[in-house]
């Protein structure tokens, strides 16, 4: 009933709660002397379904058979209509349409940790659309039955709130969930389990790692577990890896030795636990422990290269370069590099520790046979030294690689190719491809890059420290014993026309011809390797086409003579530069008048 129903009643048969698809009979009847004031024949009873009129009848009562009600709640209201007055509400009723509960499926129970509480979950099946009560029942030893009822509207989980203890770990318990509503009831299939089946241990905690004698080979992982844990799984990986190493251990009692860790590596460790070999489930993984393994002395050897530069008749400058060891070879923080320089015949040796650099430059006499050894040191020791005999790398002309070419290969890559030297190609022990940014001054401070290539290779892709629109001086060395031959070429990964032309800084007259001097184009405006310069000239105030002279680009050249100018004629001169992509704009214009005699 939805209000006081003083004037009449609404009755519903067979019930206010019906099965979907059922028919109901709704009767609205007026109480005595509650009809229209003058004449009861004029009583008009109207039945509403929500706000929609579905039936009416003149008299003291109305009967209506209703079918096809939807799932959920439907409100019916009976009203009385008298002549010349508003409809008066008599009474109403709610009808609840639903279905009997389906059998709950997939009942499963779990206790998280030895001190946790038992909680069960199940699938309810389709919504009943009615208030449905779920009772979870657990039958156990000693003729005991535990039960708890669910007070939620949609119940598919219940926590008993109490704890199963391991006093009889193999004793059987049987769980069952029963759903009951006004239209029926249904119970799940029973789920039988033991303590060992349903207790999921808490993840291990208080994880620590110890390295005996600061050695990675003597590493023990420690942790704490719940008392009944029998099995553990350990997983660990370097922090920068996605792949785990996995170890299963039995009766570990909270410790395990790890034998295959890499030195000076940050690892992530996690542990999981289980109570029984084949019963129950694994705990969640523990929180991660992150720890760095100790250093070990470096392995591997440095890749060392060098450059020689003539200073004067008695001295030469040696610049040594080496590459960092890989992380796996360094096995720790490299504290310094040890460079030893030795004159092989006289036996004089000089050792120096280099920190913060991977290069070293010194001046030595041009006489004598010199060798260097370079090693890397961390807190635990040094790598094996790399020994190199200093020789003239380009001395053996017959060892010079032939037909060296350098071609752009995609973004910021240059493919260098060559042919073996004329001399017996099988004598070549290795090739070294070296590249550095081309600087007109031949600046020795420009970083040097190199890579080594096996003797049977005739190409190398260089990509390290290659920038677009920069010209590189590329050398290919063929090494054989204590001899070397080399060839060089200029190359770039990407080029376009230079942004500016050379700046003419002076024009001087020499014996009837002129010498033009210019400043190099700034490196950042060259936009690749320059191929040519062009010098243009024409008579001032003339509309004729200018004459031009094209000069092949050479790094060190920045002057050129012209001898085809007429005396006592004023000329305008300018220059451009060309890459493979095209010609620059004009450089500055200079006027010049040759003072020499006319022929």
């Amino acid at each position: 009933k939805i209000d006081a129903c003083k004037r009449g009643d609404v009755t519903v048969k067979p019930s206010h709660v019906i099965l979907l698809g059922s028919t109901v009979n709704i009767t609205c009847s007026l109480k005595p002397r509650q009809g229209c004031f003058h004449y009861s024949r004029r009583n008009k009873l109207i039945l509403y379904k929500f706000d929609r009129r579905i039936n009416f009848h003149h008299g003291h009562s109305l009967n209506s058979q209703v079918t096809g009600l939807p799932l959920g709640t439907t409100l019916f209201v009976c009203k009385l209509a008298c002549i010349n007055s508003d409809e008066i509400q008599i009474c109403g009723a709610e009808i609840f349409v639903g279905v009997a509960p389906e059998q709950p499926q997939n009942l499963s129970c779990i206790q998280k940790g030895e001190q946790g509480t038992v909680a069960c979950t199940w699938e309810r099946g389709r919504d009943t659309h009615l208030y449905t009560e779920y009772t979870l029942q657990l039958s156990g030893p000693k003729n005991l039955t535990w039960q708890k009822q669910c007070k939620d509207i949609y119940c598919d989980y219940l926590d008993f709130g109490i704890n199963l203890t391991p006093e009889s770990p193999e004793s059987n318990f049987t769980a069952k969930v029963t759903a009951v509503n006004s239209l029926g009831s249904s119970s799940s299939l029973p789920s039988t389990f033991t303590f060992l089946d349903i207790v999921r241990p808490l993840p291990p905690w208080d994880i620590r790692i110890k390295f005996q004698k600061a050695s990675v080979s003597r590493c023990t992982l420690y942790w704490r577990d719940e008392g009944l844990v029998l099995l553990n799984r350990l997983r660990y990986r370097p922090s920068n890896s996605r792949l785990w190493n996995m170890v299963n251990v039995t009766k570990a009692k909270g410790r395990h030795d790890l034998l295959d860790l890499k030195p000076f590596t940050e690892y992530e460790f996690q542990i999981s636990s289980k109570l029984h070999l084949y019963k129950g489930s694994w705990s969640d993984w523990s929180e991660s422990l992150r720890a760095q393994t100790p250093e070990e002395e470096p392995t591997g050897m440095l890749d060392v290269w060098y450059m020689k530069r003539h200073i004067d008749y008695s001295r030469q400058q040696i610049s040594l370069f080496w590459k960092n060891l890989s992380v796996s070879e360094a096995r720790g923080k490299i504290l310094h590099y040890q460079v030893t320089l030795q004159e092989l015949t006289g036996g004089k040796a000089m050792t120096q520790n280099i920190t913060g650099h991977t290069s070293w430059t010194t001046v030595i006499p041009r006489t004598g046979n010199w060798a260097v050894a370079v090693s890397a040191a961390n807190s635990k020791g040094s790598s094996l030294p790399t020994r190199i005999n200093i020789m003239n790398l380009c001395e053996a002309g017959l060892l010079a690689p032939r037909q060296v070419s350098a071609n752009s290969e995609g973004m910021d890559n240059i493919l260098v190719t060559w042919q073996p030297p004329r001399k017996d190609p099988s004598a070549v022990q290795e090739y070294v491809v070296e590249w550095r940014e081309l600087h007109p001054g031949g600046d020795t401070q420009v970083p040097l890059n190199w890579l080594r290539s096996r003797p049977y290779n005739v190409s190398a892709l260089i990509s390290e420290n290659i920038k677009s629109y920069i010209c590189y001086e590329i050398r290919v060395y063929a090494l054989s014993g204590d001899q070397g031959g080399c060839s060089s070429i200029l190359g770039n990964s990407k080029h376009k026309a230079p942004l500016s032309g050379p700046h003419i800084n002076a024009i001087t007259e020499e014996k009837g011809s002129i010498l033009i001097s210019w400043n190099s184009i700034p490196v950042q405006e060259q936009m690749g390797c320059l191929l040519h310069y062009r010098i243009y000239w024409k008579e001032r105030d003339s509309n004729s086409q200018p004459q031009l002279c094209e000069i092949p680009y050479r790094v060190s050249q920045n002057s050129h003579p012209i001898n085809s100018l007429q005396p006592r004629v004023t000329y305008v001169l300018w220059m451009t530069a060309l890459t493979a992509a095209g010609e620059s704009s004009h450089g500055n214009e200079r006027e010049f008048c040759l003072q020499g005699k006319a022929n």
Epitope: W146, K148, F160, G161, I162, L164, T165
Partner: nanobody
């Protein structure tokens, strides 16, 4: 101090019903497990039914469907509704209270810290 006081016992014909009450003072019933035990003449005290603080109930299968335990937090009391009584239900019924959090512990006498004096229930045939 903590006191448990049972009431509602008496004599009843077989098939009849009784409702026992247990009024508690000094502790809050909703914080503890509450149990009912009984002792028949010449026998040991045995477990009947209990309710944990989380409202899980446990009973022996011999009384299943005939006995219901309930709790009224507002009145700080626990009740035992007994239906379809049998002569073998004749005993002194004791109310008990304890901080019990385990399944097995709910049915164990030694887990209950506080006890009432008991109330006699007699079922005649």
């Amino acid at each position: 101090q903590v006191q448990l006081q049972e009431s509602g016992g008496g004599s009843v014909q077989a098939g009849g019903s009784l409702r026992l009450s247990c009024a508690v003072s000094g502790r809050t019933v909703s914080d503890y497990a509450m149990g009912w035990f009984r002792q028949a003449p010449g026998k040991e005290r045995e477990f009947v039914v209990a309710m944990s603080s989380s409202e899980t109930t446990v009973y022996t299968n011999s009384v299943k469907g005939r006995i219901t335990i309930s709790r009224d937090n507002a009145k700080n009391a626990v009740y035992l509704q007994m239906n379809a009584l049998k002569p073998e239900d004749t005993a002194v019924y004791y109310c008990s209270m304890g901080p019990i959090t385990t399944f097995q512990g709910l049915a164990r006498q030694n887990e209950y810290h506080y006890w009432g004096q008991g109330t006699q229930v007699t079922v005649s045939s």
